[in-house]
């Protein structure tokens, strides 16, 4: 907290300019009018203020806008944004995508990792949250912007938050944006993707839907197996176990096409391991891959889950 002291004679700032870099902290506090600062915020980042001086300027803005900064100030914060806490940002009402982009850009510039971080820092997450809430939904332009800065952004949202993503926004999603999503999140995103891409033809559809298939039900996988899609093993390994189990050997063979040979290398891992346990060994042998662990000939398969449901 900076003490209130009178501004020395002749030092009252008439504009935000380079002469202020020679002001001590108490002089900045006493001699810079907060309203002037607010109207000339765009100048602050073009002047080499020290971090300590920036703290004083922030303090002045906080006093002028105790209820939160207006967007006209927010859009010009630049490096001063890095001084903001989540509590500060919760008071803001950010509606312009340009403002959001400008602040994300500055923040990205100050993140030490050369790779884009998977999840935003707390103050950035708060900024994004305020912005999305203000818009009411995650529209395509917003999603485009956020995933460009944070490839893992979508996967940082809860299934409830993801439910506000309109199917039209799914076109902005790239495969890498879903890398860290868990099955619950893909369960929400998959039906939206299916809707978004429904008018595409077979091969184009598969390319687009592929990264969302971790949320696909059995019937959709069965349908895909009829379309010569040649799913790769990496995609197959991300499918829901409960969706894979009911697939027949013939269906899996059609689904994977030439990639079916990869099952051998994955036979100890889910969902392949659990699927093998559900297949007749005779059927598995038709693949010629040496997969072991299927149901021996002459054994009866009882579906206990069905039995429990009936009792």
């Amino acid at each position: 907290e900076v003490e209130k002291t009178a501004c020395p004679s002749g030092k009252k700032a008439r504009e935000i300019d380079e002469s202020l870099i020679f002001y001590k902290k108490w002089e900045l506090e006493a001699c810079v009018d907060a309203a002037l600062l607010a109207t000339q915020m765009d100048r602050v980042n073009a002047i080499p203020f020290t971090y300590e001086q920036l703290d004083v300027l922030k303090h002045k803005l906080d006093e002028l806008y105790p209820q939160g900064y207006p967007e006209s100030v927010i859009q010009h914060l630049g490096y001063l944004f890095l001084k903001m806490s989540p509590e500060d940002i919760r008071k803001w009402n950010v509606t312009s995508l340009e403002t959001l982009k400008a602040l994300l850009e500055v923040n990205k510039g100050h993140e030490m990792s050369p790779q884009a971080p998977r999840r935003p820092l707390p103050q950035v997450a708060t900024l994004i949250d305020r912005f999305v809430k203000g818009r009411g939904q995650l529209d395509k332009d917003t999603l485009d912007t956020l995933t460009a800065f944070y490839p893992g952004y979508l996967c940082s949202l809860s299934p409830e938050e993801l439910s506000s993503v309109p199917p039209s926004s799914i076109w902005a999603v790239r495969p890498q944006d879903l890398d860290t999503c868990d099955p619950r999140q893909l369960d929400v995103l998959y039906p939206k993707a299916r809707l978004a891409f429904q008018n595409m033809n077979g091969s184009e559809y598969f390319v687009k839907i592929q990264s969302f298939l971790g949320g696909a039900p059995t019937e959709d996988l069965k349908a895909l197996s009829q379309q010569n899609v040649s799913m790769d093993l990496a995609t197959f390994m991300k499918l829901r176990t409960d969706a894979v189990l009911p697939l027949t050997v013939a269906e899996v063979q059609k689904l994977l096409g030439p990639h079916v040979e990869g099952l051998k290398a994955e036979e100890r891992h889910r969902p392949v391991r659990d699927w093998i346990l559900r297949q007749r060994q005779d059927d598995l042998d038709t693949l010629g891959l040496g997969l072991q662990g299927g149901i021996p000939n002459g054994y009866l398969v009882l579906d206990l889950s069905m039995q429990e449901a009936l009792s």
């Epitope: 765009d42 100048r43 980042n45 073009a46 080499p48 020290t50 971090y51 010009h76 630049g78 490096y79 982009k101 400008a102 850009e105 500055v106 990205k108 510039g109 100050h110």
Partner: nanobody, 116 residues
């Protein structure tokens, strides 16, 4: 990856002019105020000039005010420094910078030598 590449330096006689350029890439140039900073042989770093994001306001160290002019072209992501009436004390390596407080946002520099 953020890259700032300065050019235009060289040996020049006192009273003459030079124009430095800085080609920026790997970030949204138009989102940043930009700066020129210099380091004279055996001396510390000195901020020279800054320009706002919009280019609407420019700022200068007292030692160069009235002689140097900073400008920017967002269409080519380029920052400029027009240096007129050069003096021996302007001899330095000149760096362009996104943030003069952080060395990791500077280019590799271009040497300006003012000598008769």
């Amino acid at each position: 990856e953020v890259q700032l590449v300065e050019s235009g330096g060289g040996v020049v006689q006192p009273g003459r002019s030079l124009r430095l350029s800085c080609a920026a890439s790997g970030f949204t140039f138009s989102s940043y105020a930009m700066h020129w900073v210099r380091q004279a042989p055996g001396k510390g770093l000195e901020w020279v000039s800054g320009i706002t994001r919009s280019g609407g306001a420019t700022f200068y160290a007292g030692s160069v005010k009235g002689r140097f002019t900073i400008s920017r072209d967002d269409s080519t992501n380029t920052l400029y420094l027009q240096m007129n009436s050069l003096r021996a004390e302007d001899t330095a390596v000149y760096y362009c910078s996104r943030d003069p407080r952080r060395v990791d946002y500077w280019g590799q520099g271009t040497l300006v030598t003012v000598s008769s």
